[in-house]
Amino acid sequence: QAGPLPKPTLWAEPGSVISWGNSVTIWCQGTLEAREYRLDKEESPAPWDRQNPLEPKNKARFSIPSMTEDYAGRYRCYYRSPVGWSQPSDPLELVMTGAYSKPTLSALPSPLVTSGKSVTLLCQSRSPMDTFLLIKERAAHPLLHLRSEHGAQQHQAEFPMSPVTSVHGGTYRCFSSHGFSHYLLSHPSDPLELIVSGSLEDPRPSPTRSVSTAAGPEDQPLMPTGSVPHSGLRRHWE
């Protein structure tokens, strides 16, 4: 007896972080024996969508012409062959940015910091939010993810870094979000350039536009050090 059908692969073009209103294509790649592809979205009636395979039948395209809140979430796909349905693909998490107004990111006491000293990055939103994310360009995933312990919404989150080293230098942004959907993020804050001086390495940061977040999960984020902030938020490492 043959074993289970191999699971398909699922990916998004141009990637899985999409601004509101932009298009995205979800691809599911199975085998040449596939007769039909099915895309399921978590917490939505299944199937979320069905597509006939594209020649030579080993993949299907699911098109989202304009990204909205409804499309953000966690997806899996399957294919049907003459012997039945495949195992589910690994999940694809489709994140939408631009769901809320952009927060403000600042550095206390200053974005110019001496190596060995402390700095706190402060992300502030105009309306109360319960999740704040700090990202550093070049890292594949958010560095820090702060969530309210008691669901109490806050206007800000603190990201302390101590002691600062040269690796902390670079371009940071932050996002805010509501806990009911981790797939909906605000517009990104304006960039904050953290400049670390007094180290052996050249502290000059690279230009904002030159930094690039990798497209896949293997690039590990840099983890700032520091104590848990006293903001009523707990730290969750991504």
Epitope: P14, S23, T171, R209, A215, G216, E218
Partner: antibody
Framework: QVQLQESGPGLVKPSETLSLTCTVS????????WSWIRQPPGKGLEWIGY???????NYNPSLKSRVTISVDTSKNQFSLKLSSVTAADTAVYYC?????????????????WGQGTTVTVSS | DIQMTQSPSSLSASVGDRVTITCRAS??????LAWYQQKPGKVPKLLIY???TLQSGVPSRFSGSGSGTDFTLTISSLQPEDVATYYC?????????FGQGTKLEIK
């Protein structure tokens, strides 16, 4: 600094299979989209296809029946095979990386290219 | 599949001129468009990504604009070293089609 280097035979006979390899140095192949592009003499750029680090592929519909792109993450390489070649496949072949994502600016285009390798199809 | 059409196919301009090259997609592609410069005998170089973002190290006289179907590459003050062929490319969804190219020469 990521660098790409194409390698493979410069001369291929008609009806045979063209095989090229792109070696990625200075960074990991285990993310990003990796593409092959070609440019016939005196003509424009033609996208051949890509492979995602997970092994997922997409090809130019005009070449789909003849193209295979594969990846070997252990060697930090990806490869192109183009079957049943004719003189029309004579070109400079480039490998390239489509860059990642900037939270502030969006998705990159193809930001790193190999130097290109000339392939002539002739008997 | 979406077609990318560049215009003009060639143009000649004087040093210091403002030069505009357009690229039109047959369907909307959001802002998933890149511009490349290829000097004679050289490898293509990324100039602009996400329709309007200047790649690091590219002179500020280059700029990009547009979204959806119509895109523009502008050189604010043409320099002798800008002689090249310029290509647009969509990358919203495969196939990642290039425009046919615009050859730019100095008068």
């Amino acid at each position: 600094q990521v660098q790409l280097q194409e390698s493979g035979p410069g001369l291929v006979k008609p009806s045979e299979t063209l095989s090229l390899t792109c070696t990625v140095s200075g960074g990991s192949i285990s993310s990003y989209f990796w593409s092959w592009i070609r440019q016939p003499p005196g003509k424009g750029l033609e996208w051949i296809g890509y492979i995602y680090y997970s092994g997922s592929t997409n090809y130019n519909p005009s070449l789909k029946s003849r193209v295979t792109i594969s990846v070997d993450t252990s060697k930090n390489q990806f490869s192109l095979k183009l079957s049943s070649v004719t003189a029309a496949d004579t070109a400079v072949y480039y490998c390239a990386r489509r860059g990642g994502y900037s939270y502030g600016y969006g998705y990159y285009g193809m930001d790193v290219w190999g130097q290109g390798t000339t392939v002539t199809v002739s008997s | 599949d979406i077609q990318m059409t560049q215009s003009p196919s060639s143009l000649s301009a004087s040093v210091g001129d403002r030069v505009t090259i357009t690229c039109r997609a047959s369907q909307g592609i959001s802002n998933y468009l890149a511009w490349y410069q290829q000097k004679p005998g050289k490898v293509p170089k990324l100039l602009i990504y996400a329709a309007s973002t200047l790649q690091s190290g590219v002179p500020s006289r280059f700029s990009g604009s547009g979204s959806g179907t119509d895109f523009t590459l502008t050189i604010s003050s043409l320099q002798p070293e800008d002689v090249a062929t310029y290509y647009c490319q969509k990358y919203n969804s495969a196939p990642w089609t290039f425009g046919q190219g615009t050859k730019l020469e100095i008068k």
